[in-house]
């Protein structure tokens, strides 16, 4: 899915109002020094691509994130604010349902959610190399096409 046409401000609002708090709850009890972020993103569509991948794609050692509250809210936000996103996720949803019945928090999952928090931080405030313009948001407050 191409996230270029999402309403980034609305997704950001959804993240800050609820998703961020759910991520903090998930990570509660984890030392803030424990994990170093290794996944990064360069602009908002790229950040959403990485966020989707880490949130919904089962990985070795962590197959259960898609059933977490933050994941369900992320899915809802993307479905509402990214045109055509829902249609692309039907097959993925079926696979997700088969993937795992129970929720299990492993150290690998905690590391993955730490990575997610970092990706959301960059989504909320893209930090781009300056080439002429120093803006990191377009005038319409929605789309982001700069690749500095």
């Amino acid at each position: 899915y191409d996230f270029t046409n999402c309403d980034f401000e609305k997704i950001k609002a959804a993240y800050l109002s609820t998703i961020s708090k759910d991520l903090i709850t998930y990570m509660s009890g984890t030392k803030s020094t424990e994990f170093n972020n290794t996944v990064s993103c360069s602009n908002r569509p790229h950040c959403l691509t990485e966020i989707q991948s880490l949130t919904f794609n089962p990985t070795a050692g962590c197959a259960s994130l898609a059933k977490e509250m933050f994941a369900m809210k992320t899915k809802a936000a993307l479905a509402i604010w990214c045109p055509g996103y829902s249609e692309t996720q039907i097959n993925a949803t079926q696979a997700m349902k088969k993937a795992r019945k129970s929720k299990v928090t492993t150290n690998k999952c905690l590391e993955q959610v730490s990575q997610l928090q970092g990706l959301w931080r960059r989504f909320n405030r893209p930090l781009l190399k300056q080439q002429g313009s120093s803006d990191y948001k377009d005038d319409d407050d929605k789309h982001h096409h700069h690749h500095h």
């Epitope: 993240y15 803030s32 972020n37 970092g118 959301w120 960059r122 909320n124 405030r125 803006d135 948001k137």
Partner: antibody
Framework: EVQLVQSGAEVKKPGSSVKVSCKAS????????IEWVRQAPGQGLEWIGV????????NYNENFKGRATLTADKSTSTAYMELSSLRSEDTAVYYC????????????WGQGTTVTVSS | SIVMTQTPLSLSVTPGQPASISCKAS??????VTWYLQKPGQSPQLLIY???NHYTGVPDRFSGSGYGTDFTLKISRVEAEDVGVYYC?????????FGQGTKLEIK
């Protein structure tokens, strides 16, 4: 406990350079942006720039472009702000600050470093 | 760059009474506004982020509101410990910019 500890006060001559350090502890240094802000005597806050210690990416206020250089040393969890071609108007308290967990604010600040530029 | 204009620049309030600080942006900054308090002789401290979200440990007598260009920080009942300079900040566009500050004193 998250802490940002800055280097001590500096007195510099016009035209020279100053390098202020900001040592971070209590969190994964590479994961959070470090911001630099200054405050001239009796004045408000002015944003200098920001660095991502994880990859070295920076963004500068145009007012400081070419004079300010932000760097970070992951091995010592220390961020640096170097300001060159100093003039008397650069006399200020220089702060480093960390972005918060959402990336929308500065939640921890250093104690500030006073830089005085005088001939 | 976006100019953030605060009013008033100073205010004197009786303990227990409300206080309100306005911050106007020269162009829309969506909801990307943060409020800081700098107490005398201290570094700034975070109060409110993304217009209305309380930072950890900030009393609920502080509240933020607004969208676009007009923002307000309200203190429902001012206490002696609230003295200092309040700054609004936009992080919608680089360079990030602050308001000029509002000094709150206790009567």
């Amino acid at each position: 406990e998250v802490q940002l500890v800055q280097s001590g006060a500096e007195v510099k001559k016009p035209g020279s350079s100053v390098k202020v350090s900001c040592k971070a502890s209590g969190y994964a240094f590479s994961n959070y942006l470090i911001e630099w802000v200054r405050q001239a005597p009796g004045q408000g806050l002015e944003w200098i720039g920001v660095i991502d210690p994880g990859n070295g990416d920076t963004n500068y206020n145009e007012n400081f472009k070419g004079r300010a250089t932000l760097t970070a040393d992951k091995s010592t969890s220390t961020a640096y702000m170097e300001l060159s071609s100093l003039r008397s108007e650069d006399t200020a308290v220089y702060y480093c600050a960390r972005e918060d967990n959402t990336g929308t604010a500065f939640d921890y600040w250093g104690q500030g470093t006073t830089v005085t530029v005088s001939s | 760059s976006i100019v953030m204009t605060q009013t008033p620049l100073s205010l004197s309030v009786t303990p227990g009474q409300p206080a309100s600080i306005s911050c106007k942006a020269s162009q829309s900054v969506s909801s990307d506004v943060t409020w800081y308090l700098q107490k005398p002789g201290q570094s700034p401290q975070l109060l409110i982020y993304y217009v209305s979200n309380h930072y950890t440990g900030v009393p609920d007598r502080f509240s933020g509101s607004g969208y676009g260009t007009d923002f307000t920080l309200k203190i429902s009942r001012v206490e002696a410990e609230d003295v200092g300079v309040y700054y609004c900040q936009q992080h919608h566009r680089f360079p990030l910019t602050f308001g000029q500050g509002t000094k709150l004193e206790i009567k």
